[in-house]
């Protein structure tokens, strides 16, 4: 006999879940591996997902689904620091499933919903990782937690413009379809479809930002949390031309003959998934740190324009956002190729390695651009100091790829709350759902921005000390893992985790991290709104809440203002100079030819053929 608490009728059919224990001798109910799309197999590879068709039997949703096909990091096969991010389930193209954790309250009703989107550079990630276990957050904050798998790498982001067979961005469309599933079904699980916060980290946060920008995604959720990622910035999107170049290169690498788009896609579909994964890194045009092969593409559909242009014009969802960064966003990426860096030593960096590393970190910059970066990040009284060179590299990679794009995103969002506040009243703690339109066309803006800097290094971290507070290592605190005694966190870390879960859930419920479930506000520890002028943000660590102003403003002025302009101006100079040299060469050849002809003519004794 089936337990009614564990069996739920959804729009598509019945699903059976399971009870999972949580630390205080209680439990949550989990539905793991619910299908939300038809398996994207065969002809469906590279194509947008199709909604799952109904089923008749009870669907067994008691265990995590397969992970989507992806590159696996085998750099250190015996090291949990890398292994924790690798898929812990078999990989398959049949991977479009989602998970739901429901607090074990009697008949949960209209609970706030938090939907997690994993990161992994758009080339990796899976919803089944231990660090994304939704049970602790669901139980502690009485919210419904959802996470989904989405296609990554070429399977999710291979794009050939003009082709319905591989339009690109299908991994984002997988996420959107899961959000639609939540709208259609979450009330069966006691969740409120009008109170859905999407949250993610790194490429997952970039995805969250993309749904804030993408007009067709905006109505499918209420609010957004972005952890160490935004949709703008150097690695998150490519042009259609670049996406096409990479698709063609992948075809060549796996032995597909040159031909038209249809032939190429048919050939790529005939290959084993692992064949595509094995070649994916080789399609990059240059080797750089924090660069990934198959990422979202500016397609004119999912993205009407570039994220930068949409941000600048206020073309984004009018709602509240909470976002932030970790103290050492760059360190993780340095050990994957920057000269002199290793997790297995102190990574004391020579000046020569530093200069080489800067080149790898900003691969699109010309000489003068690199010089600007070096100038900004060098202590010229101590330029050979190996510790300072190491820390500068950490800052360069982190600021360029995470911190400064996020600061820009926050400022653009906050700026529109001011602009709209002048034509209406900005509502900072609004409990409503926000409109699904743009910030720029709403006289009564609901935009408010909350920003954090996470700067606590976990006591049980397996990575070396010099790597600091690493990219991705706030996630375990957001998901409440420190509540699990066997994981060896300190009591202070458990308290920090409880605080962070409360902030995140308060924000999801009300749009304000300070407003508790009962409506009270802890006046001693108030997290202020981030504005584009003051840029107030909080430090999240085991100390009491501290408010800071300006998030790396000096450094972000380089990345967000000066460097783009410098490259724009000097790139034009370089182009003009190249063009001038080519023209001059042609002109010289012509003049030489003319001179020879004239010399020949002048040597003639008399004019002929007159």
């Amino acid at each position: 006999q089936t337990d009614p608490e564990l069996t739920i009728m959804t729009r598509l059919g019945q699903v059976q879940g399971t009870r999972l224990p949580v630390p205080d001798r209680s439990h949550v109910i989990a539905f793991l591996g619910i299908p939300f799309a038809e398996p994207p197999l065969g002809k469906m590879r590279f194509k947008p997902p199709e909604p799952k068709k109904p089923w008749n039997d009870v669907f067994d949703a008691r265990d995590y689904p397969s992970a989507c096909y992806q590159y696996v990091d085998t750099s250190y096969p015996g090291f949990s620091g890398t292994e924790m991010w690798n898929p812990n389930r078999m990989m398959s193209e049949d991977c479009l499933y989602l998970n739901v954790w429901v607090p074990a309250t009697p008949r949960p009703h209209n609970l706030t919903v938090m939907v997690w989107i994993y990161g992994g550079g758009f080339y990796s990630g899976s919803s089944s990782l231990d660090v994304y276990d939704g049970r602790y957050l669901a139980h502690s904050e009485k919210v419904v937690v959802v996470s989904m798998n989405y296609r990554v790498s070429a399977f999710g982001f291979l794009a050939l413009n003009g082709s319905a067979e591989a339009p690109g961005n299908v991994g984002l469309l997988d996420q959107r379809l899961a959000l639609q599933w939540v709208q259609d079904n979450i009330h069966f699980f006691g969740g409120n479809p009008k109170q859905v916060t999407i949250f993610g980290e790194s490429a997952g946060a970039a995805s969250v930002g993309m749904h804030l920008l993408s007009p067709d995604s905006r109505p499918k959720f209420t609010r957004a949390i972005l952890q160490s990622g935004v949709p703008n910035g150097p690695w998150r999107t490519v042009s259609f031309d670049e996406a096409r170049r990479r698709a063609i290169k992948l075809g060549r690498l796996v032995g597909c003959p040159d031909g038209n788009d249809t032939d190429l896609i048919d050939c790529l579909r005939s290959k084993q998934p692992q064949d595509l994964i094995d070649q994916e890194w080789l399609v990059l045009p240059f080797s750089g740190l924090f660069r990934f092969s198959f990422v979202p593409v500016i397609d004119g559909v999912v993205f009407p324009d570039t994220p930068e242009a949409m941000l600048n014009s206020g073309n984004f969802k009018d709602t509240q956002i909470l976002l932030g960064v970790n103290q050492n966003e760059g360190s993780y990426f340095l050990i994957y190729g920057a000269p002199g860096f290793s997790k297995d030593n102190e990574s004391l960096i020579t000046r020569e390695d530093f200069l080489q590393g800067v080149k790898m970190s900003v691969p699109h910059a010309n000489e003068i651009g690199l010089e600007a970066v070096i100038l900004q990040y060098t202590d010229w009284m101590d330029e050979d100091n190996p510790i300072k060179n190491r820390e500068a590299m950490d800052d360069i990679v982190g600021d360029h790829n995470v911190v400064c794009p996020l600061q820009h995103f926050a400022k653009m969002y906050a700026q529109y709350s001011i602009l709209q506040g002048q034509t209406g009243t900005a509502s900072q703690g609004n409990l409503g759902w926000g409109n699904s339109g743009s910030a720029s066309n709403s006289g009564n803006s609901q935009v408010s921005v909350y920003l954090y800097m996470f700067d606590h290094r976990a006591s049980n971290l397996v990575w070396p000390e010099w790597m600091g507070v690493i990219h991705g290592y706030e996630i375990e605190f957001v998901f409440g893992l420190p509540l699990e005694k066997r994981l060896n966190y300190t009591l202070e870390e458990e308290k920090l985790s409880r605080r962070m879960m409360k902030y995140w859930a308060n924000f999801a419920r009300t749009g304000n991290p300070n407003i508790n479930v009962d409506g009270s506000i802890d006046s001693r520890r108030r997290w202020p709104v981030f504005t584009s002028t003051e840029q107030k943000h909080v430090g999240l660590n085991t100390d009491s809440l501290k408010v800071h102003k300006g998030l790396k403003s000096q450094f972000c002025a380089l990345w967000n203002r000066f460097l783009p302009r410098l490259l724009n101006v000097t790139e034009n100079i370089d182009d003009a100079e190249r063009q001038w040299k080519a023209e001059f060469h042609r002109w010289s050849s012509y003049m030489m030819h003319w001179k020879n002809q004239f010399d020949h003519y002048s040597k003639q004794e008399r004019c002929t053929n007159l």
């Epitope: 590159y71 696996v72 085998t74 750099s75 250190y76 096969p77 015996g78 090291f79 949990s80 620091g81 292994e83 690798n86 692992q274 994964i277 094995d278 070649q279 994916e280 890194w281 080789l282 290793s342 997790k343 297995d344 397996v462």
Partner: antibody, heavy 125, light 106 residues
Framework: EVQLVESGGGLVQPKGSLKLSCAAS????????MHWVRQAPGKGLEWVAR??????????HYADSVKDRFTISRDDSQTMLYLQMNNLKTEDTAMYYC????????????????WGQGTSVTVSS | QIVLTQSPAIMSASPGEKVTMTCSAS?????MYWYHQKPGSSPKPWIY???NLASGVPARFSGSGSGTSYSLSVSSVEAEDAATYYC?????????FGGGTKLEIK
Amino acid sequence: EVQLVESGGGLVQPKGSLKLSCAASGFTFNTYAMHWVRQAPGKGLEWVARIRSKSNKYATHYADSVKDRFTISRDDSQTMLYLQMNNLKTEDTAMYYCVREGSYYDSSYGAMDYWGQGTSVTVSS
Amino acid sequence: QIVLTQSPAIMSASPGEKVTMTCSASSSVSYMYWYHQKPGSSPKPWIYRTSNLASGVPARFSGSGSGTSYSLSVSSVEAEDAATYYCQQYNSHPMTFGGGTKLEIK
């Protein structure tokens, strides 16, 4: 059946060179990381070098004791693994094993799951 | 580099006895691997990832441990278990082996 067969060992003078080969069969060679491990007479095991697969850009790692003297390489089309040993020293005298690293999809992931019979290298004047 | 120290270097046991050998790491590692080698033969994988027995390894063997301290145990030793056992870590480069524990059967 997985097979690893080493060859190329022998007697060589100090400062001399030698190239070891390992013929692999019975598995999809190009998807596996491969290693050389050595064992001096009557002593324990010492890891020498690792080469990863093409999807990992054939990245290599070496033990400090052989760095800048030994070079590990592979030829996926011939399913061959090589170890080029230059500037040999007497302390390089050992049995050299060609070893496969278990792949992510195997239960043996991360372990040295198949070993050849070894080829003996003696460095002596 | 991480140094692995195995103890004892040599141990002797009678058939049916329980034996335990240890492997101590100079800094914390996530997993330990164990190999078994008989004289004149190549090493064979014995225990994967701290506690998973390789195929064909008798159930009387077990592995355990965490952090810097790991062990391999045999619940009831048999004559065929005489061999040298090596621990190995792959937590960081360079990969390292312990010096080995030689198990002799009386």
